[in-house]
């Protein structure tokens, strides 16, 4: 808390400019008008205020807007965003994607902070669903964003948004999350032809049921082992040796290297030895 002191003569700030960086904290408090600060917030980010001086500016805005900042101020917060607590952010109503981008830019290169998580949560809830433009923006800043959501939260993602998802965005998703995302991806990509469809659906296949894997095995997709290893064990177990051979194509030889790992290990144990021998890989059931 900065003490209330009178502004020294001749130091009252007529505008927000770089001369203010040489003001002591108490001088900023006494000599900068909060309403002026709010109207000239777009200047703040270009001025090299110290982290400590930003405390004073935040204090002034908090006094001016005790119920939460208007979006006209929020979109120009810049580095001042780093001073906000999740409690501050919960008072905001952020509706513009441009505002969201501007604030995410401040945190760029760092992992998602509680402030950012709260901001995103407020923004998405305000929109009602995770639309494509929002998802595009969020995954550009945080490739792991999608996998940080619960299955319940993912259920609000419309199939149209799935087009914004890149394979790396799903790297850290667990099977429960892929169970939710896969049907949406299947719906989103349903009008694509065989090979193009497989390219798009591949990274979602950790949520695919047995019948869809059987259907893919009829399409000469040549699934790689890395994708196969991420499939649900319960979806792989019912597949026959012939179906797995068709699904993997030339990659079937990779099963030998993975024979001790799930789901390959469990699948091998379910097969007849005669059928496994047809692969010529020396797999022992």
């Amino acid at each position: 808390e900065v003490e209330k002191t009178a502004c020294p003569s001749g130091k009252k700030a007529p505008e927000i400019d770089e001369s203010l960086i040489f003001y002591k904290k108490w001088e900023l408090e006494a000599c900068v008008d909060a309403a002026l600060l709010a109207t000239q917030m777009d200047r703040v980010n270009a001025i090299p205020f110290t982290y400590e001086q930003l405390d004073v500016l935040k204090h002034k805005l908090d006094e001016l807007y005790p119920q939460g900042y208007p979006e006209s101020v929020i979109q120009h917060l810049g580095y001042l965003f780093l001073k906000m607590s999740p409690e501050d952010i919960r008072k905001w109503n952020v509706t513009s994607l441009e505002t969201l981008k501007a604030l995410l830019e401040v945190n760029k290169g760092h992992e998602m902070s509680p402030q950012v998580a709260t901001l995103i949560d407020r923004f998405v809830k305000g929109r009602g669903q995770l639309d494509k433009d929002t998802l595009d923006t969020l995954t550009a800043f945080y490739p792991g964003y999608l996998c940080s959501l619960s299955p319940e939260e993912l259920s609000s993602v419309p199939p149209s948004s799935i087009w914004a998802v890149r394979p790396q965005d799903l790297d850290t998703c667990d099977p429960r999350q892929l169970d939710v995302l896969y049907p949406k991806a299947r719906l989103a990509f349903q009008n694509m032809n065989g090979s193009e469809y497989f390219v798009k659906i591949q990274s979602f296949l950790g949520g695919a049921p047995t019948e869809d894997l059987k259907a893919l095995s009829q399409q000469n997709v040549s699934m790689d082992l890395a994708t196969f290893m991420k499939l649900r064990t319960d979806a792989v177990l019912p597949l026959t040796v012939a179906e797995v051979q068709k699904l993997l194509g030339p990659h079937v030889e990779g099963l030998k290297a993975e024979e001790r790992h799930r789901p390959v290990r469990d699948w091998i144990l379910r097969q007849r030895q005669d059928d496994l021998d047809t692969l010529g890989l020396g797999l022992q059931g």
Epitope: A46, P48, T50, E52, Q53, L54
Partner: antibody, heavy 119, light 107 residues
Framework: QVQLQQPGAELVKPGASVKLSCKAS????????MHWVKQRPGQGLEWIGM????????NYNEKFKSKATLTVDKSSSTAYMQLSSLTSEDSAVYYC????????????WGTGTTVTVSS | DIVMTQSQKFMSTTVGDRVSITCKAS??????VAWYQQKPGQSPKLLIY???NRYTGVPDRFTGSGSGTDFTLTISNMQSEDLADYFC?????????FGAGTKLELK
Amino acid sequence: QVQLQQPGAELVKPGASVKLSCKASGYTFTSYWMHWVKQRPGQGLEWIGMIHPNSGSTNYNEKFKSKATLTVDKSSSTAYMQLSSLTSEDSAVYYCARPVVPYWYFDVWGTGTTVTVSS
Amino acid sequence: DIVMTQSQKFMSTTVGDRVSITCKASQNVGTAVAWYQQKPGQSPKLLIYSASNRYTGVPDRFTGSGSGTDFTLTISNMQSEDLADYFCQQSSSYPLTFGAGTKLELK
């Protein structure tokens, strides 16, 4: 990787001026303030001032206001500091340094230029 | 201007020692303090920022502590490669100011 390259040494006569350069590479030059710091032999460091390459905006330590002038050339990603009316007190190593905003500590330092003022 | 005082210009140490270098600010600077290491003929290197955060790639034997006016850089297990000058810097207000430095030497 991020680098700030400076010439190794400058020998100048008392009363003359010298223009020191700092060539940046490995990052977007116009996105970061550039600061300059003085170090006299066996002494601590002194902050001279800073310039924003995009706007050309400058801020100086009062102590160096009449001594140093900061400029940039965006096309070559180079920052300059001109020192005028040199005396033996100006003999020092001068560093350019890139700060982390808004914390203003320096994560990248130039190689340093040794300025010797001697007749 | 805020004055950063490093009262010990020199400190004698031996390998394996626990070394504490202190820095005192002339007024409250919160946690806006950084520590740098400088070896002869080299540029300073950032070790600690915001009083206690270790910079990327800095060995964990280096730790920073303090807030307000008193700050400490501690090297928990002194190594020969740690023989250098150490400077503190405040970034609470302009002009930014540095301590005069503490030189670590072998006993």
